[in-house]
């Protein structure tokens, strides 16, 4: 429940446009089980690359590609009767305010990859 | 290339832990490309659960829940030689700082799950 | 770290019954799956039964009607009813857990069928 009941929520039109936010994170060792060589293992591989960026917190963001077109088989091979497909993800991210060395920031939004899946296509016929 | 080039970097141990933000998303109309239905079409199908908490900016948020242990084959049944696991990712978001009702936020992190995708498991044998 | 615990094998006469127990502990998820499989002398590790998320089961042909597997999801346990025993079913009958990502095997308990 709301700690606070008559607060508006952060969302709400007429919530103040700007905050103070504390950059010392909560639950910095949030920690995901195991979850490091999925990108290895799945039928839909991917590799992450490294996202960098100053003006922005946080300043690096991994990035999946996945490997391969088609999905990989129980034997190893690629097949193309179906598809590794990008999860992505909206996430938020501080972004440095020009003009504003030290303290001044916009809330933005970035699609991110998460990791690949592998889907059925959707088979389309063209006229 | 950094707007301030002598500004520290935001993770910097002499960084400002409080600083301005403003509220008014950039890019609020990122859109994941025809991703909305993965979930369904994946060999690791997931459903999607809303997970809502007024004291957090986003107060709404999509968790994935993978469907199945094994991994829906080609002919539809599920396969237990390969198993369904979430893709986690972990995301900033604001937490509302008690007893500072308006403008006063944290940074939080939290792992969450994006969608499923199908991994050969780790055969490991107990002692 | 997942711990398996088996039980119930033994030496049993042709047409005679035993009953496997196998409970594990250390992690538990929502999607599971518990089972056994079987190594015969000089034969490959093969499917007995297994038991998904506590509901759906599935079994070898060769034991279908004789075998039957249940769960206790409170005790994240499963149990092998081995009925009308041939000596075909000896074999080392090992504990299988599946969690996401990962396939726990345990140690194995012997069932000696003699004729």
């Known amino acids: 429940s709301p700690q606070n009941p008559g607060c508006p929520n952060a969302e709400d039109k007429n919530f103040p446009r700007t905050v103070m936010v504390n950059l010392n994170i909560r639950n910095r060792n949030t920690n995901s089980k195991r979850a490091s060589d999925y990108y290895n293992r799945s039928s839909s591989p991917w590799n992450l690359h490294r996202n960098e960026d100053p003006e922005r917190y946080p300043s690096v963001i991994w990035e999946a590609k996945c490997r391969h077109l088609g999905c990989v088989d129980a034997d190893g091979n690629v097949d193309y009767h179906m598809n590794s497909v990008p999860i992505q993800q909206e996430i938020l991210v501080l972004r440095r305010e020009p003009r504003h060395c030290t303290n001044s920031f916009r809330l933005e939004k970035m699609l991110v990859s998460v990791g690949c899946t592998c889907v059925t296509p959707i088979v389309r016929h063209v006229a | 290339s950094p707007q301030n080039p002598g500004c520290p970097n935001a993770e910097d141990k002499n960084f400002p832990r409080t600083v301005m933000v403003n509220l008014n998303i950039r890019n609020r109309n990122t859109n994941s490309k025809r991703a909305s239905d993965y979930y369904n079409r994946s060999s690791s199908p997931w459903n999607l659960h809303r997970n809502e908490d007024p004291e957090r900016y986003p107060s709404v948020i999509w968790e994935a829940k993978c469907r199945h242990l094994g991994c829906v084959d080609a002919d539809g049944n599920v396969d237990y030689h390969m198993n369904s696991v979430p893709i986690q990712q972990e995301i900033l978001v604001l937490r509302r700082e008690p007893r500072h009702c308006t403008n006063s936020f944290r940074l939080e992190k939290m792992l969450v799950s994006v969608g499923c995708t199908c991994v050969t498991p780790i055969v490991r044998h107990v002692a | 770290e997942v711990q398996l615990v088996e039980s119930g094998g033994g030496l049993v006469q042709a047409g005679g019954s035993l009953r496997l127990s196998c409970a594990a502990s250390?992690?538990?998820?929502?999607?599971?799956?518990m089972g056994w499989y079987r190594a015969a002398p000089g034969k490959q590790r093969e499917l007995v039964a297994i038991?998904?998320?506590?509901?759906?089961?599935n079994y070898a042909d060769s034991v279908k009607g004789r075998f039957t597997i249940s769960r206790d999801s409170a005790k994240n346990a499963v149990y092998l009813q081995m009925n009308s025993l041939k000596p075909e079913d000896t074999a080392v009958y090992y504990c299988?857990?599946?969690?996401?990502?990962?396939?726990?095997w345990g140690q194995g308990t012997q069932v000696t069928v003699s004729s």
């Open positions: 038991i998904v998320n506590g509901g759906s089961t």
């Open positions: 250390g992690v538990i998820f929502r999607l599971n799956a």
């Open positions: 299988y857990y599946n969690i996401p990502g990962d396939v726990y």
